[in-house]
C-alpha cells in the first residue's frame, strides 16, 4: 500500500497519528474489530501528552482503549510494551473485580470519567477511540 500522509475525513491528526472518536458504545471486541477494519487499532496511550489529548476529545465518558489482559498479562494491541510504558490507572486499579455478577473478571481497560484508567468487563458497551499512525504503509484497498 501507499504511505499515508494525511488523516482520513472525520479523523483528528495529532503528533503524526490520526484518531477517530466514536459517538456510541460497543463491546471491546466489536470496537477492536471496527478499528482493525479501518486499518487502525484501538488507541494506544504512550505518553502523558497523548493521554491529555485523548481525554480532551472524549470528555467524561467511559471509553475503551487498546489495552487488555484477556490472555493473562496486560498487552497493548499494537505490541507496545506494557511494563515499561505509560500508565494512568485509577488508585487500586486494575483489580480484576469479580463482584459484578456478569461472570469472569475484568480484562479490558477504559478511560473513566476523569481520564484515569480502569479495568472492566469487556462486554460493556463503551465508546471507543481508533488510532492509526501517519507515515505507515496504508493497507487500505482501492474502492473495488
Amino acid at each position: 500500500g501507499s504511505e499515508r500522509t494525511c488523516c482520513p475525513v472525520n479523523w483528528v491528526e495529532h503528533e503524526r497519528s490520526c484518531y477517530w472518536f466514536s459517538r456510541s458504545g460497543k463491546a471491546w471486541a466489536d470496537a477492536d474489530n471496527y478499528c482493525r477494519l479501518e486499518d487502525a487499532h484501538l488507541v494506544v496511550v504512550t505518553s502523558w501528552e497523548e493521554q491529555k489529548f485523548v481525554q480532551h476529545h472524549i470528555g467524561p465518558v467511559n471509553t475503551w482503549m487498546g489495552l487488555h489482559d484477556q490472555n493473562g498479562p496486560w498487552k497493548w494491541v499494537d505490541g507496545t510494551d506494557y511494563e515499561t510504558g505509560f500508565k494512568n490507572w485509577r488508585p487500586e486499579q486494575p483489580d480484576d473485580w469479580y463482584g459484578h455478577g456478569l461472570g469472569g473478571g475484568e480484562d479490558c481497560a477504559h478511560f473513566t470519567d476523569d481520564g484515569r484508567w480502569n479495568d472492566d468487563v469487556c462486554q460493556r458497551p463503551y465508546r471507543w477511540v481508533c488510532e492509526t499512525e501517519l507515515d505507515k504503509a496504508s493497507q487500505e484497498p482501492p474502492l473495488l
Epitope: N10, S22, R23, Y34, P141, L143
Partner: antibody, heavy 113, light 107 residues
Amino acid sequence: QVQLVESGGGLVKPGGSLRLSCAASGITFSDYYMNWIRQAPGKGLEWVSYISSSGRTIFYADSLKGRFTISRDNAKNSLYLQMNSLRAEDTAVYYCAADTIYWGQGTLVTVSS
Amino acid sequence: DIQMTQSPSSLSASVGDRVTITCRASQGIRNDLGWHQQKPGKAPKRLIYAASSLQSGVPSRFSGSGSGTEFTLSISSLQPEDFATYYCLQHNSFPFTFGPGTKVDIK
C-alpha cells in the same frame, strides 16, 4: 431498539436492475460498518459487500464485482445496494447487517423471465 | 479466501441435550468469529462474538470457544426454541465467509 429495514426487492427480468435500501434506526449509524448478505432459497448465507463507516473502504464478493455497487448516506442513516445485470442466480433474500451485530429482516429479490 | 467448514451439517437432538457444533477455518483467523442462529423465515441473530463472548440478551446456555482455526458452539441444555440453523462467520479478512450451517432439529 435497533431496527434495520430493507426495501426495494421485487421481481425483475434477467439483465435488469434493482436498488435496495436499508434504513437504520436505534443506532449511531456512522459508528457502524455495514454489510449486505444474501440467502438463496433453501441455501446458506453468503456475504455480498462491505462498506466502512465513512464509505471510503468498500469490498465485494469476487463473483459480484462490476455488477453491484454499495453506498451509504450517513445523514439519512441509510445503506444502498445498486444491482445491475441481474441473473437468475442472484435470486435471494438480501439482508443488511450493521457490523455483524444487527440484521434486518431482509427483502426478496427474484430474477426471472 | 478463507474457507469455513462446519460439522455436523445437521443433527437431531432432544430437549435437555447438550449440543456441540464445530467450525474450522482454512487459515488462522485469531478470534474473529461469530455464531449466528437462524430460524425458518427469520433473519439471523448473533449469539456469540469474538469466538467466546456472549451477545447481550442471549441465554447463558449458549457458549463459544476456540481461536485460530478451530471453534465450537455449545448449547448446554437444548430448549424448544433452540431448534434452528447455526452459522459461523469469519470477519478476519475479506471476503467475509460463512460456514455452510448446521441444522438442529428435534429427535
